[in-house]
Protein backbone atom coordinates (compact mmCIF):
# COMPACT_ATOMS: atom_id res chain seq x y z
CA UNK A 1 0.00 0.00 0.00
CA UNK A 2 1.17 3.51 -0.86
CA UNK A 3 2.59 5.52 2.06
CA UNK A 4 0.31 8.13 3.56
CA UNK A 5 0.61 11.66 2.18
CA UNK A 6 -0.76 14.79 3.89
CA UNK A 7 -2.19 17.15 1.29
CA UNK A 8 -2.78 20.84 1.93
CA UNK A 9 -4.19 21.95 -1.44
CA UNK A 10 -4.08 25.71 -0.75
CA UNK A 11 -0.66 27.34 -0.76
CA UNK A 12 -2.23 30.51 0.60
CA UNK A 13 -5.51 31.75 2.00
CA UNK A 14 -6.53 35.41 2.33
CA UNK A 15 -9.10 36.31 4.98
CA UNK A 16 -10.50 39.62 6.24
CA UNK A 17 -10.16 40.32 9.95
CA UNK A 18 -13.22 39.14 11.86
CA UNK A 19 -14.04 36.43 9.34
CA UNK A 20 -13.46 32.66 9.44
CA UNK A 21 -10.48 30.99 7.78
CA UNK A 22 -10.82 27.51 6.32
CA UNK A 23 -7.57 25.53 6.19
CA UNK A 24 -7.91 22.41 4.09
CA UNK A 25 -6.10 19.13 4.73
CA UNK A 26 -6.64 15.55 3.58
CA UNK A 27 -4.72 12.34 4.16
CA UNK A 28 -4.34 9.68 1.46
CA UNK A 29 -4.51 6.71 3.84
CA UNK A 30 -5.91 5.61 7.20
CA UNK A 31 -2.63 3.98 8.13
CA UNK A 32 -0.68 4.48 10.37
CA UNK A 33 -3.14 4.95 13.23
CA UNK A 34 -2.71 8.24 15.03
CA UNK A 35 -4.07 11.75 15.31
CA UNK A 36 -3.78 14.80 13.08
CA UNK A 37 -2.63 18.04 14.68
CA UNK A 38 -2.44 21.56 13.29
CA UNK A 39 0.46 23.91 13.99
CA UNK A 40 1.35 27.46 13.07
CA UNK A 41 4.94 27.76 12.02
CA UNK A 42 7.59 25.06 11.76
CA UNK A 43 10.33 23.74 13.99
CA UNK A 44 10.51 23.34 17.76
CA UNK A 45 8.86 26.67 18.54
CA UNK A 46 5.76 26.05 16.47
CA UNK A 47 2.40 26.80 18.05
CA UNK A 48 -0.25 24.14 18.55
CA UNK A 49 -3.45 25.29 16.86
CA UNK A 50 -5.59 22.19 17.10
CA UNK A 51 -5.29 18.75 18.64
CA UNK A 52 -8.29 16.57 17.97
CA UNK A 53 -8.34 14.59 21.20
CA UNK A 54 -7.06 16.93 23.85
CA UNK A 55 -6.88 20.62 24.55
CA UNK A 56 -8.99 23.74 24.45
CA UNK A 57 -9.24 25.40 21.05
CA UNK A 58 -12.40 27.52 21.29
CA UNK A 59 -11.96 29.22 17.91
CA UNK A 60 -11.31 26.01 15.96
CA UNK A 61 -13.91 23.67 14.48
CA UNK A 62 -13.42 20.73 12.16
CA UNK A 63 -15.01 20.82 8.71
CA UNK A 64 -15.99 17.14 8.87
CA UNK A 65 -16.54 14.59 11.63
CA UNK A 66 -13.02 13.31 12.30
CA UNK A 67 -14.40 10.28 14.13
CA UNK A 68 -16.43 9.05 11.14
CA UNK A 69 -15.26 5.73 9.82
CA UNK A 70 -12.72 6.12 6.99
CA UNK A 71 -12.59 9.91 7.42
CA UNK A 72 -9.56 11.41 5.73
CA UNK A 73 -10.59 15.09 5.78
CA UNK A 74 -8.79 16.97 8.53
CA UNK A 75 -9.66 20.50 7.44
CA UNK A 76 -10.32 23.09 10.14
CA UNK A 77 -12.02 26.45 10.44
CA UNK A 78 -10.60 29.22 12.63
CA UNK A 79 -13.14 31.85 13.65
CA UNK A 80 -12.84 35.57 14.32
CA UNK A 81 -9.51 35.97 12.54
CA UNK A 82 -7.22 38.83 13.61
CA UNK A 83 -3.92 40.02 12.10
CA UNK A 84 -2.13 38.10 14.88
CA UNK A 85 -3.33 34.86 13.23
CA UNK A 86 -1.26 35.41 10.10
CA UNK A 87 1.35 32.75 9.41
CA UNK A 88 1.91 29.36 7.80
CA UNK A 89 -0.26 26.52 9.09
CA UNK A 90 0.79 22.89 8.90
CA UNK A 91 -1.42 19.83 9.06
CA UNK A 92 0.66 17.07 10.70
CA UNK A 93 -0.07 13.34 10.95
CA UNK A 94 1.18 11.57 14.09
CA UNK A 95 1.73 7.87 14.63
CA UNK A 96 0.61 6.31 17.91
CA UNK A 97 3.52 6.01 20.33
CA UNK A 98 4.42 5.88 23.99
CA UNK A 99 4.73 8.02 25.99
CA UNK A 100 4.16 10.51 23.15
CA UNK A 101 2.78 10.10 19.66
CA UNK A 102 5.46 10.49 17.00
CA UNK A 103 5.30 12.92 14.09
CA UNK A 104 4.90 10.94 10.89
CA UNK A 105 4.20 13.28 7.98
CA UNK A 106 3.48 16.98 7.52
CA UNK A 107 1.57 18.83 4.84
CA UNK A 108 3.35 21.48 2.77
CA UNK A 109 1.69 24.31 4.71
CA UNK A 110 -0.90 26.96 3.97
CA UNK A 111 0.00 30.61 4.40
CA UNK A 112 -2.78 32.56 6.05
CA UNK A 113 -2.76 36.25 5.22
CA UNK A 114 -5.10 38.58 7.05
CA UNK A 115 -6.53 41.73 5.60
CA UNK A 116 -7.26 44.19 8.41
CA UNK A 117 -8.72 47.66 8.07
CA UNK A 118 -6.78 50.64 9.37
CA UNK A 119 -8.24 52.37 12.42
CA UNK A 120 -9.89 55.76 11.90
CA UNK A 121 -7.08 58.29 11.38
CA UNK A 122 -6.51 60.54 14.38
CA UNK A 123 -5.23 64.02 13.54
CA UNK A 124 -3.61 66.12 16.22
CA UNK A 125 -2.24 69.63 16.00
CA UNK A 126 0.32 71.61 17.99
CA UNK A 127 -0.05 71.95 21.75
CA UNK A 128 0.02 75.76 21.60
CA UNK A 129 -1.74 78.19 19.27
CA UNK A 130 0.21 79.92 16.53
CA UNK A 131 -0.33 83.11 14.58
CA UNK A 132 -0.76 83.65 10.82
CA UNK A 133 2.35 83.29 8.67
CA UNK A 134 3.71 80.68 11.06
CA UNK A 135 4.17 77.05 10.02
CA UNK A 136 2.59 74.45 12.26
CA UNK A 137 2.81 70.67 12.27
CA UNK A 138 -0.10 68.22 12.26
CA UNK A 139 0.26 64.51 12.86
CA UNK A 140 -1.98 61.73 11.61
CA UNK A 141 -1.93 58.17 12.97
CA UNK A 142 -3.72 55.00 11.95
CA UNK A 143 -3.08 51.49 13.26
CA UNK A 144 -3.76 47.80 12.87
CA UNK A 145 -3.88 47.41 9.10
CA UNK A 146 -2.63 44.61 6.91
CA UNK A 147 -1.21 44.22 4.30
CA UNK A 148 1.42 46.95 4.59
CA UNK A 149 0.62 48.89 1.41
CA UNK A 150 -1.28 52.06 2.26
CA UNK A 151 -1.72 55.58 0.85
CA UNK A 152 -1.99 58.72 2.97
CA UNK A 153 -2.87 62.20 1.70
CA UNK A 154 -3.24 65.56 3.42
CA UNK A 155 -5.71 68.30 2.49
CA UNK A 156 -6.38 71.81 3.67
CA UNK A 157 -9.88 72.94 2.73
CA UNK A 158 -9.95 70.41 -0.11
CA UNK A 159 -6.56 71.40 -1.50
CA UNK A 160 -3.94 68.66 -1.37
CA UNK A 161 -0.84 69.44 0.67
CA UNK A 162 2.63 68.39 -0.41
CA UNK A 163 4.81 69.21 2.59
CA UNK A 164 4.52 66.06 4.72
CA UNK A 165 6.52 63.03 5.79
CA UNK A 166 5.05 59.56 6.30
CA UNK A 167 6.35 56.40 7.97
CA UNK A 168 4.84 52.92 8.02
CA UNK A 169 6.01 50.73 10.91
CA UNK A 170 7.44 48.24 11.39
CA UNK A 171 9.75 48.14 8.39
CA UNK A 172 9.95 44.33 8.34
CA UNK A 173 7.32 41.60 8.33
CA UNK A 174 4.57 41.99 10.88
CA UNK A 175 1.05 40.82 11.59
CA UNK A 176 -0.21 44.41 11.33
CA UNK A 177 1.15 47.87 10.65
CA UNK A 178 0.82 51.49 11.73
CA UNK A 179 1.19 54.70 9.74
CA UNK A 180 2.40 58.02 11.11
CA UNK A 181 2.50 61.20 9.06
CA UNK A 182 3.49 64.79 9.86
CA UNK A 183 2.30 67.66 7.66
CA UNK A 184 3.46 71.27 7.75
CA UNK A 185 0.77 73.92 7.29
CA UNK A 186 1.29 77.69 6.90
CA UNK A 187 -1.44 79.60 8.73
CA UNK A 188 -3.22 82.57 7.22
CA UNK A 189 -5.55 85.12 8.85
CA UNK A 190 -8.50 83.43 7.10
CA UNK A 191 -7.89 80.00 8.64
CA UNK A 192 -10.33 80.15 11.56
CA UNK A 193 -12.87 78.16 9.52
CA UNK A 194 -10.23 76.00 7.83
CA UNK A 195 -9.89 72.24 8.22
CA UNK A 196 -6.92 69.95 7.81
CA UNK A 197 -7.83 66.46 6.62
CA UNK A 198 -5.76 63.28 6.66
CA UNK A 199 -7.06 60.66 4.23
CA UNK A 200 -6.03 57.01 4.35
CA UNK A 201 -6.67 54.56 1.48
CA UNK A 202 -6.20 50.81 1.90
CA UNK A 203 -7.18 47.69 -0.02
CA UNK A 204 -9.61 46.71 2.75
CA UNK A 205 -11.57 49.95 2.38
CA UNK A 206 -12.78 49.18 -1.16
CA UNK A 207 -12.15 52.67 -2.51
CA UNK A 208 -13.84 54.44 0.39
CA UNK A 209 -10.95 56.08 2.27
CA UNK A 210 -10.99 56.91 5.96
CA UNK A 211 -10.59 60.53 7.01
CA UNK A 212 -9.45 62.27 10.14
CA UNK A 213 -9.89 66.02 10.55
CA UNK A 214 -8.55 68.85 12.65
CA UNK A 215 -10.12 72.30 12.80
CA UNK A 216 -7.60 75.11 12.55
CA UNK A 217 -9.80 77.06 14.97
CA UNK A 218 -8.11 74.90 17.65
CA UNK A 219 -4.66 75.91 16.40
CA UNK A 220 -4.76 79.50 15.18
CA UNK A 221 -4.52 82.73 17.10
CA UNK A 222 -5.30 85.88 15.13
CA UNK A 223 -4.04 88.89 17.11
CA UNK A 224 -6.30 91.94 17.10
CA UNK A 225 -5.69 95.25 15.36
CA UNK A 226 -6.48 98.26 17.53
CA UNK A 227 -7.78 101.65 16.54
CA UNK A 228 -8.45 104.43 19.05
CA UNK A 229 -10.65 107.28 17.86
CA UNK A 230 -12.17 110.30 19.46
CA UNK A 231 -15.89 110.77 18.93
CA UNK A 232 -17.76 114.09 18.75
CA UNK A 233 -18.49 115.73 22.10
CA UNK A 234 -21.42 114.27 23.99
CA UNK A 235 -21.56 117.06 26.61
CA UNK A 236 -19.80 120.34 27.22
CA UNK A 237 -16.74 118.84 29.07
CA UNK A 238 -16.94 115.20 28.00
CA UNK A 239 -15.12 113.43 25.22
CA UNK A 240 -16.03 109.91 24.06
CA UNK A 241 -13.01 107.84 23.02
CA UNK A 242 -13.51 104.39 21.43
CA UNK A 243 -11.12 101.51 21.01
CA UNK A 244 -11.97 99.29 18.06
CA UNK A 245 -10.56 95.79 18.52
CA UNK A 246 -10.76 94.05 15.16
CA UNK A 247 -10.19 90.66 13.58
CA UNK A 248 -9.14 88.63 16.61
CA UNK A 249 -9.48 84.93 17.43
CA UNK A 250 -10.15 83.23 19.81
CA UNK A 251 -12.60 85.38 21.75
CA UNK A 252 -10.69 85.45 25.05
CA UNK A 253 -9.72 89.10 25.43
CA UNK A 254 -9.34 91.65 28.20
CA UNK A 255 -9.14 95.40 27.63
CA UNK A 256 -7.80 98.04 30.02
CA UNK A 257 -8.12 101.82 29.63
CA UNK A 258 -5.30 103.91 31.06
CA UNK A 259 -5.40 107.70 31.59
CA UNK A 260 -1.85 109.00 31.72
CA UNK A 261 -0.68 105.53 32.63
CA UNK A 262 -3.19 104.99 35.42
CA UNK A 263 -5.76 102.25 35.11
CA UNK A 264 -9.16 103.71 34.52
CA UNK A 265 -11.25 100.65 33.68
CA UNK A 266 -10.81 96.94 32.81
CA UNK A 267 -13.35 94.86 30.95
CA UNK A 268 -13.63 91.47 29.31
CA UNK A 269 -14.88 91.04 25.75
CA UNK A 270 -18.43 89.75 25.91
CA UNK A 271 -20.81 91.02 23.27
CA UNK A 272 -18.57 90.52 20.26
CA UNK A 273 -19.55 90.50 16.61
CA UNK A 274 -18.34 87.69 14.37
CA UNK A 275 -16.85 88.33 10.96
CA UNK A 276 -17.42 86.07 7.95
CA UNK A 277 -13.93 84.65 8.33
CA UNK A 278 -14.66 83.56 11.92
CA UNK A 279 -12.67 86.31 13.62
CA UNK A 280 -14.29 88.72 16.08
CA UNK A 281 -14.66 92.48 16.45
CA UNK A 282 -15.32 94.34 19.64
CA UNK A 283 -15.54 97.99 20.64
CA UNK A 284 -14.98 99.66 23.98
CA UNK A 285 -15.53 103.28 24.77
CA UNK A 286 -14.35 105.67 27.45
CA UNK A 287 -16.07 108.90 28.49
CA UNK A 288 -13.39 111.36 29.55
CA UNK A 289 -14.23 114.39 31.71
CA UNK A 290 -11.92 116.98 30.20
CA UNK A 291 -12.55 119.55 32.91
CA UNK A 292 -10.97 117.20 35.44
CA UNK A 293 -7.66 117.48 33.64
CA UNK A 294 -5.45 120.56 33.56
CA UNK A 295 -2.89 119.08 31.20
CA UNK A 296 -3.11 117.01 28.02
CA UNK A 297 -4.38 113.45 28.58
CA UNK A 298 -2.75 110.37 27.13
CA UNK A 299 -5.40 107.68 26.73
CA UNK A 300 -4.17 104.15 26.18
CA UNK A 301 -6.25 101.17 25.10
CA UNK A 302 -4.38 98.09 26.27
CA UNK A 303 -5.49 94.64 25.13
CA UNK A 304 -4.43 91.26 26.46
CA UNK A 305 -5.55 88.62 23.95
CA UNK A 306 -5.63 84.88 24.74
CA UNK A 307 -3.01 85.15 27.48
CA UNK A 308 -0.44 86.84 25.21
CA UNK A 309 1.63 89.91 26.11
CA UNK A 310 -0.51 93.03 25.98
CA UNK A 311 -0.63 95.29 22.95
CA UNK A 312 -1.73 98.88 23.19
CA UNK A 313 -2.65 101.93 21.20
CA UNK A 314 -2.60 105.46 22.58
CA UNK A 315 -4.43 108.69 21.80
CA UNK A 316 -3.42 112.16 22.98
CA UNK A 317 -6.30 114.32 24.12
CA UNK A 318 -5.45 118.03 24.07
CA UNK A 319 -7.12 119.69 27.03
CA UNK A 320 -6.02 123.21 25.98
CA UNK A 321 -8.20 123.07 22.87
CA UNK A 322 -11.87 124.05 23.21
CA UNK A 323 -13.87 120.86 23.68
CA UNK A 324 -16.21 121.73 20.80
CA UNK A 325 -13.36 122.26 18.38
CA UNK A 326 -11.66 119.19 19.71
CA UNK A 327 -14.81 117.15 19.24
CA UNK A 328 -15.32 118.19 15.66
CA UNK A 329 -11.94 116.82 14.72
CA UNK A 330 -12.55 113.08 14.66
CA UNK A 331 -9.14 112.49 13.21
CA UNK A 332 -7.51 113.86 16.33
CA UNK A 333 -3.85 113.25 16.95
CA UNK A 334 -3.00 109.59 17.35
CA UNK A 335 0.41 108.70 18.62
CA UNK A 336 0.23 105.39 16.79
CA UNK A 337 0.84 101.97 18.14
CA UNK A 338 2.71 101.89 21.38
CA UNK A 339 3.24 98.18 22.06
CA UNK A 340 4.62 97.19 25.45
CA UNK A 341 4.50 94.28 27.82
CA UNK A 342 2.55 94.72 31.04
CA UNK A 343 3.10 92.28 33.93
Amino acid sequence: EEELQVIQPDKSVLVAAGETATLRCTATSLIPVGPIQWFRGAGPGRELIYNQKEGHFPRVTTVSDLTKRNNMDFSIRIGNITPADAGTYYCVKFRKGSPDDVEFKSGAGTELSVRAKPSAPVVSGPAARATPQHTVSFTCESHGFSPRDITLKWFKNGNELSDFQTNVDPVGESVSYSIHSTAKVVLTREDVHSQVICEVAHVTLQGDPLRGTANLSETIRVPPTLEVTQQPVRAENQVNVTCQVRKFYPQRLQLTWLENGNVSRTETASTVTENKDGTYNWMSWLLVNVSAHRDDVKLTCQVEHDGQPAVSKSHDLKVSAHPKEQGSNTAAENTGSNERNIY
Partner: antibody
Framework: EVQLQQSGAELVKPGASVKLSCTTS????????IHWVKQRPQQGLEWIGR????????KYDPKFQDKATITADTSSNTAYLQLSNLPSEDTAVYYC???????WGQGTLVTVSA | DIVLTQSPASLAVSLGQRATISCRAS??????????MQWYQQKPGQPPKLLIY???NVESGVPARFSGSGSGTDFSLNIYPVEEDDIAMYFC????????FGGGTKLEIK
Protein backbone atom coordinates in the same frame (compact mmCIF):
# COMPACT_ATOMS: atom_id res chain seq x y z
CA GLU B 1 -25.51 22.52 25.38
CA VAL B 2 -22.62 20.30 26.44
CA GLN B 3 -23.42 18.15 29.47
CA LEU B 4 -21.70 15.38 31.42
CA GLN B 5 -24.23 13.79 33.73
CA GLN B 6 -22.81 11.49 36.38
CA SER B 7 -24.57 8.71 38.27
CA GLY B 8 -25.72 9.18 41.85
CA ALA B 9 -23.87 8.75 45.14
CA GLU B 10 -22.73 5.26 46.14
CA LEU B 11 -22.27 3.70 49.57
CA VAL B 12 -20.12 0.59 49.32
CA LYS B 13 -18.46 -1.79 51.74
CA PRO B 14 -14.67 -2.09 51.97
CA GLY B 15 -13.28 -4.60 49.45
CA ALA B 16 -16.31 -4.21 47.14
CA SER B 17 -16.42 -2.76 43.62
CA VAL B 18 -18.45 0.06 42.11
CA LYS B 19 -19.14 1.22 38.53
CA LEU B 20 -19.75 4.93 37.94
CA SER B 21 -21.26 6.32 34.76
CA CYS B 22 -20.84 9.60 32.89
CA THR B 23 -23.49 10.16 30.23
CA THR B 24 -22.66 12.91 27.76
CA SER B 25 -24.71 15.06 25.41
CA UNK B 26 -24.31 18.15 23.23
CA UNK B 27 -21.11 17.05 21.48
CA UNK B 28 -19.62 14.23 19.47
CA UNK B 29 -18.73 11.67 22.14
CA UNK B 30 -15.95 10.14 20.04
CA UNK B 31 -14.30 13.51 19.41
CA UNK B 32 -12.22 13.85 22.55
CA UNK B 33 -10.77 11.96 25.46
CA ILE B 34 -12.87 11.49 28.59
CA HIS B 35 -10.85 11.73 31.80
CA TRP B 36 -11.64 10.59 35.34
CA VAL B 37 -10.42 12.54 38.37
CA LYS B 38 -10.56 11.68 42.09
CA GLN B 39 -10.94 14.20 44.92
CA ARG B 40 -10.85 13.06 48.52
CA PRO B 41 -12.65 15.22 51.11
CA GLN B 42 -10.79 18.51 51.63
CA GLN B 43 -7.98 17.28 49.36
CA GLY B 44 -6.57 17.99 45.93
CA LEU B 45 -7.33 16.53 42.52
CA GLU B 46 -5.84 13.22 41.35
CA TRP B 47 -5.91 12.09 37.75
CA ILE B 48 -7.03 8.45 37.42
CA GLY B 49 -6.92 7.93 33.67
CA ARG B 50 -8.59 8.60 30.33
CA UNK B 51 -10.24 6.86 27.41
CA UNK B 52 -10.47 7.65 23.71
CA UNK B 53 -14.09 6.67 22.97
CA UNK B 54 -13.28 6.45 19.26
CA UNK B 55 -11.04 3.40 19.69
CA UNK B 56 -11.18 2.50 23.42
CA UNK B 57 -7.52 3.44 23.84
CA UNK B 58 -6.91 3.99 27.58
CA LYS B 59 -4.15 5.43 29.76
CA TYR B 60 -3.92 5.29 33.55
CA ASP B 61 -1.87 6.84 36.28
CA PRO B 62 0.29 3.92 37.49
CA LYS B 63 -1.15 4.39 40.96
CA PHE B 64 -4.64 3.46 39.66
CA GLN B 65 -3.57 0.85 37.11
CA ASP B 66 -4.86 -2.09 39.19
CA LYS B 67 -7.68 -0.18 40.83
CA ALA B 68 -9.55 1.45 37.97
CA THR B 69 -11.01 0.32 34.66
CA ILE B 70 -12.30 2.92 32.21
CA THR B 71 -14.66 1.93 29.41
CA ALA B 72 -16.92 3.69 26.94
CA ASP B 73 -20.14 2.85 25.15
CA THR B 74 -20.53 4.91 21.98
CA SER B 75 -24.12 3.77 21.45
CA SER B 76 -25.21 5.55 24.65
CA ASN B 77 -22.44 8.22 24.69
CA THR B 78 -21.46 7.04 28.16
CA ALA B 79 -18.09 6.59 29.84
CA TYR B 80 -17.66 4.31 32.84
CA LEU B 81 -15.23 4.08 35.72
CA GLN B 82 -15.09 0.79 37.58
CA LEU B 83 -13.26 0.82 40.91
CA SER B 84 -12.41 -2.49 42.54
CA ASN B 85 -11.30 -3.71 45.95
CA LEU B 86 -12.20 -0.43 47.60
CA PRO B 87 -10.57 0.58 50.91
CA SER B 88 -11.90 3.47 53.02
CA GLU B 89 -9.24 5.81 51.52
CA ASP B 90 -11.16 5.62 48.25
CA THR B 91 -13.99 7.59 49.81
CA ALA B 92 -14.00 10.55 47.45
CA VAL B 93 -15.84 12.50 44.79
CA TYR B 94 -15.09 11.14 41.31
CA TYR B 95 -15.39 13.49 38.34
CA CYS B 96 -15.50 12.77 34.64
CA UNK B 97 -14.17 15.54 32.38
CA UNK B 98 -13.86 16.18 28.68
CA UNK B 99 -10.40 16.56 27.15
CA UNK B 100 -10.97 20.28 26.52
CA UNK B 101 -10.68 21.06 30.28
CA UNK B 102 -13.94 23.03 30.21
CA UNK B 103 -16.68 20.47 30.64
CA TRP B 104 -16.86 18.47 33.85
CA GLY B 105 -19.50 16.27 35.36
CA GLN B 106 -21.06 17.29 38.65
CA GLY B 107 -19.19 14.52 40.47
CA THR B 108 -20.22 11.27 42.16
CA LEU B 109 -19.59 10.78 45.87
CA VAL B 110 -18.43 7.26 46.69
CA THR B 111 -18.42 6.46 50.39
CA VAL B 112 -16.55 3.32 51.42
CA SER B 113 -17.75 2.29 54.85
CA ALA B 114 -18.57 -0.88 56.71
CA ASP C 1 4.90 11.54 35.69
CA ILE C 2 5.22 15.32 35.65
CA VAL C 3 4.92 16.54 39.24
CA LEU C 4 3.42 19.98 39.85
CA THR C 5 4.43 21.84 43.00
CA GLN C 6 2.00 24.62 43.83
CA SER C 7 2.69 27.40 46.32
CA PRO C 8 1.61 28.73 48.68
CA ALA C 9 -0.78 26.14 50.12
CA SER C 10 -2.92 28.97 51.49
CA LEU C 11 -3.01 32.69 50.86
CA ALA C 12 -4.79 35.52 52.69
CA VAL C 13 -5.21 38.71 50.69
CA SER C 14 -7.05 41.97 51.38
CA LEU C 15 -9.90 42.89 49.05
CA GLY C 16 -8.60 44.94 46.13
CA GLN C 17 -5.06 43.60 46.50
CA ARG C 18 -3.13 41.19 44.27
CA ALA C 19 -2.98 37.42 44.74
CA THR C 20 -0.20 35.45 43.06
CA ILE C 21 -0.10 31.65 42.99
CA SER C 22 2.89 29.76 41.60
CA CYS C 23 3.16 26.36 39.99
CA ARG C 24 6.44 24.62 39.18
CA ALA C 25 6.63 21.52 36.97
CA SER C 26 9.25 18.80 37.47
CA UNK C 27 9.90 18.94 33.72
CA UNK C 28 8.91 21.21 30.85
CA UNK C 29 5.25 21.20 29.88
CA UNK C 30 6.05 22.82 26.53
CA UNK C 31 4.53 21.08 23.54
CA UNK C 32 6.55 22.67 20.76
CA UNK C 33 5.78 26.37 21.29
CA UNK C 34 2.69 25.90 23.46
CA UNK C 35 2.70 25.56 27.26
CA UNK C 36 0.11 22.96 28.18
CA MET C 37 -0.67 24.42 31.62
CA GLN C 38 -4.16 25.21 32.92
CA TRP C 39 -5.53 26.90 36.03
CA TYR C 40 -8.82 26.04 37.73
CA GLN C 41 -10.97 27.55 40.45
CA GLN C 42 -13.00 25.23 42.68
CA LYS C 43 -15.65 26.19 45.18
CA PRO C 44 -17.10 23.77 47.76
CA GLY C 45 -19.49 21.21 46.29
CA GLN C 46 -18.67 22.18 42.70
CA PRO C 47 -16.43 20.70 39.99
CA PRO C 48 -13.31 22.65 38.99
CA LYS C 49 -13.91 25.60 36.67
CA LEU C 50 -11.38 26.42 33.94
CA LEU C 51 -9.87 29.91 34.28
CA ILE C 52 -6.73 29.86 32.13
CA TYR C 53 -5.63 27.48 29.40
CA UNK C 54 -2.32 27.11 27.58
CA UNK C 55 -0.61 29.14 30.34
CA UNK C 56 -1.98 32.58 29.49
CA ASN C 57 -5.30 32.36 27.64
CA VAL C 58 -8.27 33.53 29.69
CA GLU C 59 -11.30 31.31 29.24
CA SER C 60 -14.44 32.96 27.87
CA GLY C 61 -16.61 34.42 30.62
CA VAL C 62 -13.77 34.58 33.16
CA PRO C 63 -13.24 38.12 34.56
CA ALA C 64 -10.19 40.03 33.33
CA ARG C 65 -8.96 40.13 36.94
CA PHE C 66 -7.51 36.67 36.26
CA SER C 67 -4.33 36.32 34.27
CA GLY C 68 -1.79 33.57 33.70
CA SER C 69 1.86 33.68 32.71
CA GLY C 70 4.95 31.54 32.41
CA SER C 71 6.49 28.92 30.15
CA GLY C 72 8.56 25.76 30.38
CA THR C 73 8.43 24.80 34.04
CA ASP C 74 7.43 27.98 35.93
CA PHE C 75 3.93 29.38 35.86
CA SER C 76 1.81 31.78 37.86
CA LEU C 77 -1.80 32.80 38.27
CA ASN C 78 -2.53 36.42 39.17
CA ILE C 79 -5.78 37.78 40.53
CA TYR C 80 -6.05 41.56 40.72
CA PRO C 81 -7.97 43.15 42.24
CA VAL C 82 -9.16 40.33 44.51
CA GLU C 83 -12.90 40.26 45.14
CA GLU C 84 -15.03 38.45 47.73
CA ASP C 85 -16.25 36.05 45.04
CA ASP C 86 -12.68 34.81 44.49
CA ILE C 87 -12.58 32.89 47.79
CA ALA C 88 -11.94 29.33 46.55
CA MET C 89 -9.35 26.63 45.95
CA TYR C 90 -7.08 27.09 42.92
CA PHE C 91 -5.33 24.27 41.07
CA CYS C 92 -2.78 24.17 38.28
CA UNK C 93 -2.88 21.26 35.82
CA UNK C 94 -0.55 20.11 33.06
CA UNK C 95 -1.65 18.13 30.02
CA UNK C 96 1.75 17.72 28.35
CA UNK C 97 1.84 14.05 29.43
CA UNK C 98 -1.55 12.75 30.53
CA UNK C 99 -2.88 14.97 33.38
CA UNK C 100 -1.45 15.90 36.75
CA PHE C 101 -2.59 18.57 39.20
CA GLY C 102 -0.86 20.80 41.68
CA GLY C 103 -1.69 20.36 45.36
CA GLY C 104 -3.96 23.42 45.41
CA THR C 105 -3.96 26.88 46.99
CA LYS C 106 -6.70 28.04 49.34
CA LEU C 107 -7.41 31.75 48.81
CA GLU C 108 -8.88 33.60 51.78
CA ILE C 109 -9.70 37.23 52.44
CA LYS C 110 -7.79 39.08 55.18
Amino acid sequence: EVQLQQSGAELVKPGASVKLSCTTSGFNFKDMYIHWVKQRPQQGLEWIGRIDPENDDTKYDPKFQDKATITADTSSNTAYLQLSNLPSEDTAVYYCARGNYVHWGQGTLVTVSA
Amino acid sequence: DIVLTQSPASLAVSLGQRATISCRASESVQYYGTSLMQWYQQKPGQPPKLLIYAASNVESGVPARFSGSGSGTDFSLNIYPVEEDDIAMYFCQQSRRVWTFGGGTKLEIK
